[in-house]
Structure formats: C-alpha cells, structure tokens
C-alpha cells in the first residue's frame, strides 16, 4: 500500500490521543535505556510503511502484536485516514485469523514495540535534511 495520500495530521492526532498511550501501557515496566532504535524512516509515508510492517507482520520471536489494543487502533486509524487502505488489508486479515496464537509478551515483542515508538516519533516529527 502507498501511504502518500493519507491524512497525516489526523493519524498523528489519533496517535497522540490513544495509540501512544496503549504503546506505553504495553511497555510498562521496561527500562527506558533498554532498547536502541535500529529501524528508521525518512518521511511520513515511509514511516507508515515501516509502522504497518512492524505492527502487523509476525516476526521471529514475536507473532502476537496484531491483536494488541495499539495495533487495532493503528489499523482503524489507517483504515479511516488512508484512502483504499482497508481494501488492501482484507486478504491479510483473513491470513492473520488462521495464524492467531495465544498472546505472549516476549522480550522480542517489547523490543519491537520500542522500535514502533521510535518510528511513530519520527512520523510525528520528521527531521528533514536542511538544504
């Protein structure tokens, strides 16, 4: 999906009001020094591409994020504020239902959510290179 035509300001508002708080809840008890951000993004569409990938694609050691509250709210925000996004996700959702597993918060998942917080941070404040 090409995130270029999303309403970035509406997504940002949704992030600040709810999604960010759910991410903080998920990370509660984790030291702020624990994880270094290794995934980066260069502009808002790129940030959303990376956010979608980390939130909804199962990775080795962390297969369960898609059912978390922050993920469901992320999905809703993208569906509402990115034209045509929900249509592209129908097949992905059906595949995810088949893969559904018991929710387990592993250290790998905590690291992944820390990366997500970093991607959202850059989505909110893209630091463009000065000309």
């Amino acid at each position: 999906y090409d995130f270029t035509n999303c309403d970035f300001e509406k997504i940002k508002a949704a992030y600040l009001s709810t999604i960010s708080k759910d991410l903080i809840t998920y990370m509660s008890g984790t030291k702020s020094t624990e994880f270094n951000n290794t995934v980066s993004c260069s502009n808002r569409p790129h940030c959303l591409t990376e956010i979608q990938s980390l939130t909804f694609n199962p990775t080795a050691g962390c297969a369960s994020l898609a059912k978390e509250m922050f993920a469901m709210k992320t999905k809703a925000a993208l569906a509402i504020w990115c034209p045509g996004y929900s249509e592209t996700q129908i097949n992905a959702t059906q595949a995810m239902k088949k893969r559904r597993k018991r929710k387990v918060t592993t250290n790998k998942c905590l690291e992944q959510v820390s990366q997500l917080q970093g991607l959202w941070r850059r989505f909110n404040r893209p630091l463009l290179k000065q000309q």
């Epitope: 300001e9 940002k12 508002a13 992030y15 600040l16 009001s17 960010s20 903080i24 702020s32 020094t33 624990e34 994880f35 270094n36 951000n37 980066s40 917080q117 970093g118 959202w120 941070r121 850059r122 989505f123 909110n124 404040r125 630091l127 463009l128 290179k129 000065q130």
Partner: antibody, heavy 119, light 107 residues
C-alpha cells in the same frame, strides 16, 4: 531517571566562540532528538536548532545558520552546541532539551548554561 | 517561518480565578501545539502537547484546546504555584518557534 546536565557558565569576548555541552543520562541517547533553545535576559524562548544523535543530522534556525554547529558524541551520550563570532546580543541562557516519547514536545530540559559576552 | 503570537502578554489574577491564555499561529498548524510553564531561573516545564493532551503529572485544572490557528490554555482555578510565564510552541514543522509569552502575576 532522565537527566540533561549542562556545562557551567561562560564569559566570552565579542568575536570569540563558545561550546556548551549537554550530558544525557537515564534514557537511550540515540533514540531521541536533542534541541537547543536560548533565552536572553528578561526575554522569551528562541529555538536555535536540533540534532539527531544517531545520524548526526542537524537543522538550524536561519538566524544562526553559519554561526552554530551542533554535534553529538554517542560514546559519552553528550550533545554539544558551538556558537561562533559572538556578539553582545548572544548573552543568554542556553538550554538543551530532549524530545518526548511521542516526538510532539520536549519533556526534559537541561538546567541552562549562562553565556555572557562582554568586552 | 510560522509566527506564534500570545495574548495577553501579561495578566493579573487572584488565587481561585479561572484564566485563559490564547495563542495564534500565522498559518494552519492543525493540533501541533505545545504549552510550557516557566518560573524565574528555571527551565520550562511541559504542560500540554498536541494542543489538548495533558503531560504526565500536570494537574487537571490545566486544559488545552483549539486547532488550526487558534489555541488556548485554561487554568480552571488558579493556585499559588501557577503564577509563572507561559509559552506556546508550534510542533508542526522545522523550524519550531515559540510564542511571545504570557506572564501571569498575582493581583
């Protein structure tokens, strides 16, 4: 807990340079932007620029372009702001500040470094 | 650059009063506005981000509102520790700029 510890007060002559340090602790230094803000005596806050400690990317206010250099040392979790060709109007308190978890504000500030420029 | 204008520049009020400070942006900044409180000789402290979200540990008597170009910070019942200078700042795009400040004094 998160702390930004700045270097001590400086007295400089017009035309000289000053380098202010901001040592971060209590968080992953490279994950968050560091901004620099100054405040002249009895005046408001003035944004100077920002650095991404991970990449070294910077963005400076037009007003300070050519006179300011912001750097970061990842090994010591320290950000630096160097201002050159000093003039009396540069006399101010200089603050470093860390961007918040959400990237939508500054949640922690240094205590400030007072710079006096006088002949 | 986006200009931020605060009003009033100073304000006298009493403990228990309800006060509102306003901030105007020279162009649409959506909800990308922050409010800080600063006391003499101290660094500013974050009160509100995203125009209406209260920062951790900030008393509920503070509230922010607005979007686009017009914003306000309201203190519902002034407490002695609230007498300070308040600044808005846009967080829309680099370069960021601060408002001119509002000094809140005891009447």
């Amino acid at each position: 807990q998160v702390q930004l510890q700045q270097s001590g007060a400086e007295v400089k002559k017009p035309g000289a340079s000053v380098k202010v340090s901001c040592k971060a602790s209590g968080y992953a230094f490279t994950n968050y932007l560091i901004e620099w803000v100054r405040q002249a005596p009895g005046q408001g806050l003035e944004w100077m620029g920002v650095i991404n400690p991970e990449s070294g990317d910077t963005y400076y206010s037009q007003k300070f372009q050519g006179r300011v250099t912001m750097t970061a040392d990842k090994s010591t979790s320290t950000a630096y702001m160097e201002l050159s060709s000093l003039r009396s109007e540069d006399s101010a308190v200089y603050f470093c500040a860390k961007e918040s978890l959400t990237g939508s504000s500054y949640d922690y500030w240094g205590q400030g470094t007072t710079l006096t420029v006088s002949s | 650059d986006i200009q931020m204008t605060q009003s009033p520049s100073s304000l006298s009020a009493s403990v228990g009063d309800r006060v509102t400070i306003t901030c105007r942006a020279s162009e649409n900044i959506y909800s990308n506005l922050v409010w800080y409180q600063q006391k003499p000789g101290k660094a500013p402290q974050l009160l509100v981000y995203g125009a209406r979200n209260l920062a951790d540990g900030v008393p509920s008597r503070f509230s922010g509102s607005g979007s686009g170009t017009q914003f306000s910070l309201t203190i519902s019942s002034l407490q002695p520790e609230d007498f300070a200078t308040y600044y808005c700042q846009h967080f829309y795009e680099t370069p960021l700029t601060f408002g001119t400040g509002t000094k809140l004094e005891i009447k």
